[in-house]
Interface confidence: medium
Amino acid sequence: MAVTACQGLGFVVSLIGIAGIIAATCMDQWSTQDLYNNPVTAVFNYQGLWRSCVRESSGFTECRGYFTLLGLPAMLQAVRALMIVGIVLGAIGLLVSIFALKCIRIGSMEDSAKANMTLTSGIMFIVSGLCAIAGVSVFANMLVTNFWMSTANMYTGMGGMVQTVQTRYTFGAALFVGWVAGGLTLIGGVMMCIACRGLAPEETNYKAVSYHASGHSVAYKPGGFKASTGFGSNTKNKKIYDGGARTEDEVQSYPSKHDYV
C-alpha cells in the first residue's frame, strides 16, 4: 500500500513539475526591466526565451519573437535546449510511469517489469528536473552578470546628458516557476525510484525438490506441472504439486538454477 502511495504521489508531483517546466519555458517574463533609478522612461521591457515584450505607460503591450538564431547569444540557445530536453524527458517519463503505476493493470505485466518502468521514469524525472534547474540557473547567472555590468556602467558615465542608460534587468516570474517546477520534478523522480525498490520482488530461495516417477522421465516445470512424455495418463498437464503455491501478488516465479532438478 505504501509503495502504491509513494509511486502515485511521485507521479502526481512529477506531473505538476513538468507542467510547470512547460509553463516556465513558454512564459515571457524570464527577465523584467528593473525600473529602479530610471523613472523617466515610459516603456517597460521584459523578455522570454522566445520573444521580447514592450509595455507602454498607456498599458499597451506588444511582444515580438526572436526570428533569427544567428544573432542570439549561445547561452540563450543553451537555456532553450536545456528546457526542451527537460520537457521531452519529462513527457516520456510521464508516459512510461502511467504504465508503471501499480494501481493500473495492463494485461499480465509482472511486478518486475513495473519496477523497471518505475525506475526508468524516476531517472527520467530526475534528469528532467535537473535540466530545468540548470537552464533557469544559467539564465539567472546571465542576468546577474548583466545586472552588475549595467550597474557599473550606470555610475561611471554620469557626466552631462547620459547618451546610454544601461537598462538593468532582474529575475522574472518564469525563473521562480522554473526553479520550483524543476524541484518538484526532481522530488517526484526520487519518489518513483524509492517506489521502485518496494515494487521489485525479493529473491525467492527455491528448495530443490527431486521427483521420482516410475517408468517415465520427469522434469519439474516452473509452474508446478508434470511434463508428460505423451504416453502416460497425465496428458492434460494437470497440476500434481501444489505444496508451495502462493498468490500472484505474493511471489513471482523466475527461472533460476533450482528450477530444473
Epitope: S31, R64, G71, N146
Partner: nanobody, 121 residues
Framework: QVQLVESGGGLVQPGGSLRLSCTAS????????MHWYRQAPGKQRELVAS???????HYADSVKGRFTISRDIAKKMQYLQMNSLKPEDTAVYYC???????????????WGQGTLVTVSS
C-alpha cells in the same frame, strides 16, 4: 558603439511645421521601440510619441492629431512630423530608442543629445 543623433530642430512660427529626424548607428541586432520625448524649460521630461516594434503608434494627448511619428527600419531612422505648432510646444526634443546590440539578449535605452524646437512669432 551605438549612438542616436537627432536633427531638424529650429525656430518656427506658431501654426508652422517641422520634421525631426533621428538616426541610430552602430551594430544593432534588434529595435524594441523608438520614442520622442520633450523637456520644456523648468518642466519634467514627457513622452510625446512612440512607435512599437510592429509599427503601432501612440501619442501624448497634447499632440494628438498634430504630430506624426514614423520610421524606416532599414535605415534605422525615426521621424517626428510636427504640424500646427503652438508656443507651448517649445522644448528640447529627445530621440529615445530601446536597442539590442548584436550578440545581446537585453535591450538598452539610448538617448540622443536633444534638438531645440522654438515656437515663437
Amino acid at each position: 558603439q551605438v549612438q542616436l543623433v537627432e536633427s531638424g530642430g529650429g525656430l518656427v512660427q506658431p501654426g508652422g511645421s517641422l520634421r525631426l529626424s533621428c538616426t541610430a548607428s552602430g551594430s544593432i541586432f534588434r529595435i524594441d521601440g523608438m520614442h520622442w520625448y520633450r523637456q520644456a524649460p523648468g518642466k519634467q521630461r514627457e513622452l510625446v510619441a512612440s512607435i512599437t516594434p510592429s509599427g503601432i503608434t501612440h501619442y501624448a494627448d497634447s499632440v494628438k492629431g498634430r504630430f506624426t511619428i514614423s520610421r524606416d527600419i532599414a535605415k534605422k531612422m525615426q521621424y517626428l512630423q510636427m504640424n500646427s505648432l503652438k508656443p507651448e510646444d517649445t522644448a528640447v526634443y529627445y530621440c529615445n530608442a530601446h536597442l539590442v546590440k548584436v550578440g545581446g539578449v537585453w535591450s538598452d535605452e539610448y538617448w540622443g543629445q536633444g534638438t531645440l524646437v522654438t515656437v515663437s512669432s
